[in-house]
């Protein structure tokens, strides 16, 4: 039948009529850095060009016998998953293979670097259409490999990599940890993270999304018409490379940032059983399974945003954590989270000419995370307006006073160790949507943006006493840009965006013995771009 | 014989060369750093990627590689330049003893050095 994985990456048909997938990838070239491949396999014959690039270490063991079918196994299967005739994702995509892994599936960082350099030189010598580079490999964290990936990405190449099969934090591996690379974890037919022997898919904040990666049927190097089932984050990454090729072929001008945002936006949300991940990694790991866009049109008007978590700050008193957006994304809001609840908030600040989100640990805290909301907002002009602690009054307020600027996010930062001992502020009065409000002993930061047709509104949901979690979501057609909590007491562990929902976590009232007067409110800022909507209507 | 990419394949055990001076000592206050894989079994000691500062030209990369070879030779060490990088990152890949790391980190234009390590099919 039709393989389960191809069904899984296809969006459910919401009309009785036929789902038209985007272009099959015909304008895109996919580079595969892997083992050697069996290029005359029926699935990939005429679709894959084997380059003369080879940089592999000697096989281990004196008695190792090179057997062609074993040497070609991994690469052949992946080439089939990307563009195979019967079981491939992007059947129109052409591929080029570079051999950087030996017959045992082992390579080196240096060999991979030289392979990436080869691709860059090929691109310069003969510029073609969009390029996707698939790196179905992983090693330990490597500064140089990540740097090379960054350079290639900044040259306009889309890099897709396996998160790794070590049932571990993907940030400890390369190229999975490179922020510019699209890092893919693996799920199975039941939307469970894939278990591989005693290990399994990697997870954590360095994973961008998951994709099918268990029992994936594809070309087998045992014979030119054979098929075999393989599992791993390589297979998952191959699906995303195929989806990327189809999306880029339909819209060749897409930037890496635009492609990543679309991959996230069109993914199936909240289908993965998170219980499989270690508890401390659940909040950091995206609950997203890759899927093709529902149709070729209609995405352009969307205001796309994603959530970027920082590394953990560490526990020292003055420790901070920084979350950064990609070069062509706008930081529209900044929040923070601490499992212990001991934090000193967050602020948006300029670093190297770009806004970053910095979270501050507090004395006795186990550390904090900074959470950036990174959005695609063409022709945006954003700035941060700060109000110092009001001290005497009920709360600190700041608003967007520039003509045409709208509020996209609120942050608060305080120097006192424990805001919980101080009287909480009154909530923001109604009818003043362009205003941030916070504790009187906190400085408040408003992210104010001007962009064509940008409109935003504030949505709140409060509960009388902390109950672990309060959420508020933006309606259909609106995108969550800001997520914060009122008040900033020590009961609040922090706030963060999950897709289009603002989540505020607080200590459970039963464990803290707090009084019911300490209401916790989740405050979402929801935006949309009339300009983008009109522009896309004019195109259609 | 070097090819167009500057991939030096010869083993060098040279006498002191003109380039073995300190004409281009590293700028004051900038110390190059050494990195290696945190997973011990995956380390490949003896092969190092020497990454040079961003704006370094190919000719400077080649000169820095030759300087390392000359300085190593003076100390009685064999080195082999396996590849000179340009296009993505400036730098070179060198096969040498770990004893030479301290020396290599002091070379001009060096940003950091990373010991080679293994990657695996996933």
């Amino acid at each position: 039948s039709i393989p389960w994985n191809l069904e899984r990456i296809t969006p459910p048909r919401y009309r009785a009529d036929e789902y038209q997938p985007p272009d099959g990838g015909s304008l895109v070239e996919v580079y595969l850095l892997d083992t050697s491949i069996q290029s005359d396999h029926r699935e990939i014959e005429g679709r894959v060009m084997v380059t003369d690039f080879e940089n592999v270490p000697e096989e281990d063991g004196t008695r190792f016998h090179r057997q062609a079918s074993k040497c070609d196994s991994h690469g052949t299967h992946l080439a089939g998953v990307v563009s195979g005739r019967d079981a491939g994702v992007a059947k129109g995509a052409s591929m080029r293979s570079l051999r950087v892994l030996n017959c045992q599936g082992k390579g080196t960082v240096s060999g991979t670097l030289i392979g990436l350099e080869f691709i860059r030189k090929s691109q310069l010598v003969q510029p073609v259409g969009p390029l996707v580079v698939l790196l179905p490999l992983a090693g330990g964290y490597s500064r140089v490999l990540n740097a090379a990936c960054q350079r290639l990405a900044r040259a306009g190449v889309v890099l897709v990599t396996a998160a790794g099969n070590f049932r571990d934090d993907a940030c400890l591996y390369s190229p999975a940890s490179a922020p510019e690379v699209i890092t893919v974890g693996a799920t199975n037919a039941q939307d469970q993270p894939v278990t591989l022997g005693t290990l399994g898919t990697n997870f954590g904040r360095c994973v961008d999304l998951f994709a099918p990666g268990e029992d994936i049927i594809g070309a087998s190097s045992d014979c030119s018409t054979c098929f075999v089932s393989q599992s791993g984050t390589s297979q998952a990454a191959a699906h995303v490379a195929g989806i990327a090729a189809m999306m880029l072929s339909a819209e060749p001008e897409l930037t890496l940032a635009e492609l990543r945002q679309r991959l996230i936006h069109f993914s199936a949300k909240d289908v993965i059983n998170e219980a499989w991940f270690p508890e401390d990694q659940r909040v950091l790991t995206p609950n997203l399974v890759a899927a093709l866009p529902p149709s070729t049109h209609g995405a352009g008007w969307q205001l796309f945003c994603r959530t970027v978590w920082s590394a953990h700050s560490g526990p020292t008193r003055m420790a901070t954590a920084i979350a950064r957006c990609a070069p062509d994304e706008e930081l529209l809001s900044c929040s923070s989270f601490s499992r212990s609840g001991k934090r000193r908030g967050e602020r948006m600040e300029a670093q190297g000419g770009k806004l970053v989100c910095r979270a501050h640990n507090a004395f006795g805290g186990e550390g904090v995370y900074a959470i950036a909301r990174c959005c695609l907002l063409p022709q945006a002009n954003c700035s941060v307006h700060t109000a110092p602690p009001a001290e005497a009054s009920m709360g600190t307020r700041v608003h967007c006073h520039q003509q045409g600027h709208v509020l996209t996010g609120c942050s608060s930062h305080w120097e006192v160790e424990d805001l919980g001992t101080h009287k909480p502020p009154v909530l923001r009065p109604r009818g003043q949507p362009n205003q941030c409000v916070g504790h009187r002993e906190a400085s408040i930061h408003a992210s104010c943006c001007h962009a064509p047709g940008l409109e935003c509104k504030v949505k709140e949901h409060g509960i009388p006493a902390p109950q672990g979690q309060v959420t508020v979501a933006c309606e259909e057609g609106w995108t969550l840009t800001g997520c914060s909590a009122l008040p900033g007491t020590s009961h609040v562990l922090g706030a963060y965006a999950v897709d289009n929902t603002c989540v505020v976590r607080s200590r459970d009232v039963s464990t803290t013995g707090s009084t019911s007067e300490e209401a916790v409110t989740a405050v979402a800022i929801c935006c949309r771009s009339r300009h983008l909507a009109q522009a896309s209507q004019e195109l259609q | 014989q070097e090819d167009e990419d500057g991939d030096y394949e010869e083993l060098v055990l040279a006498l002191r060369s003109e380039e073995d001076g300190l004409a281009e000592a590293p700028e004051h206050g900038t110390t190059a750093t050494f990195h290696r894989c945190a997973k011990d079994p995956w380390r490949l000691p003896g092969t190092y990627v020497v990454v040079l500062k961003e704006e370094t030209h190919l000719s400077q990369s080649e000169r820095t590689a030759r300087r390392l070879q000359a300085q190593a030779a003076r100390r009685g060490y064999l080195t082999k330049i396996l590849h000179v990088f340009h296009g993505l990152l400036p730098g070179f890949l060198v096969k040498m003893s770990g004893d030479l790391l301290e020396l290599a980190l002091k070379l001009p234009h060096v940003d950091y050095i990373e010991e080679d390590s293994s990657v695996f099919a996933q």
Partner: antibody, heavy 119, light 109 residues
């Protein structure tokens, strides 16, 4: 393993009613349009009806409109066909089939259940 | 009377190439993709070709599909005795119905 299992067929008199069921396993039922297809003895395949993932849209072949009702219960992974005012020409093997999202085709079929309308 | 038109029968000897045609209109084949099903007597139909020319896994590459205008065809090369079955074409129609061909009985002589 992906499976569709039909039941509820049997002998019924003209004008009578019957309710067919199809129980699904091995895939996310709520992600798919589902169809009923029938085959009269010695004849070809004829599509009867289909239903959207959430049950909000239903389509029927003209010959059964107003008599047959397709429905589903996603919680029970079940598809139904309520057949009223049955006629002799409704005699057939009734198959339930999944409509592939990727392929836009009936990619998984049940084994069929026989409905005989006769006095 | 089926909406899509197929020849009622076709035959060939082992090893031969056989083609089965399927004719429709602009409201179905002309604007939609075509699927082909194989039905061995006494069993449920099986998807053979989808989206005009795509093969599900497990279908030998002896089977191929094509479409041109409002017609489609199924080709079977290297005919084998196990190919003896009924073959149906199908497509979605603008009338919001799935439509089938009347079926072609293939005999391997």
């Amino acid at each position: 393993e992906v499976q569709l299992v039909e039941s509820g067929g049997g002998l019924v008199q003209p004008g009578g009613s019957l309710r067919l069921s199809c129980v699904v396993s091995g895939f996310t039922f709520s992600s798919y349009w589902m169809s009923w297809v029938r085959q009269a003895p010695g004849k070809g395949l004829e599509w009867v009806a289909n239903i959207k993932q959430d049950g909000s849209e239903k389509y029927y072949v003209d010959s059964v409109k107003g008599r047959f009702t397709i429905s589903r219960d996603n919680a029970k992974n079940s598809l139904y066909l309520q057949m009223n005012s049955l006629r002799a020409e409704d005699t057939a093997v009734y198959y339930c089939a999944r409509e592939s999202n990727w392929g836009f085709a009936f990619d998984i079929w049940g084994q069929g259940t026989m409905v005989t309308v006769s006095s | 009377q089926s909406v899509l038109t197929q020849p009622p029968s076709a035959s060939g000897t082992p090893g031969q190439r056989v083609t089965i045609s399927c004719s429709g209109s602009s409201s179905n084949i002309g604007s939609k993709t075509v699927n082909w099903y194989q039905q061995v007597p006494g069993t449920a139909p099986k998807l053979l070709i989808y989206r005009n020319n795509q093969r599900p896994l497990g279908v030998p590459d002896r089977f191929s599909g094509s479409k041109s205008g409002t017609s489609a065809s199924l080709a079977i090369s290297g005919l084998q005795s196990e190919d003896e079955a009924d073959y149906y074409c199908a497509a979605w129609d603008d009338s919001l119905n799935w439509v089938f061909g009347g079926g072609t009985k293939l005999t391997v002589l």
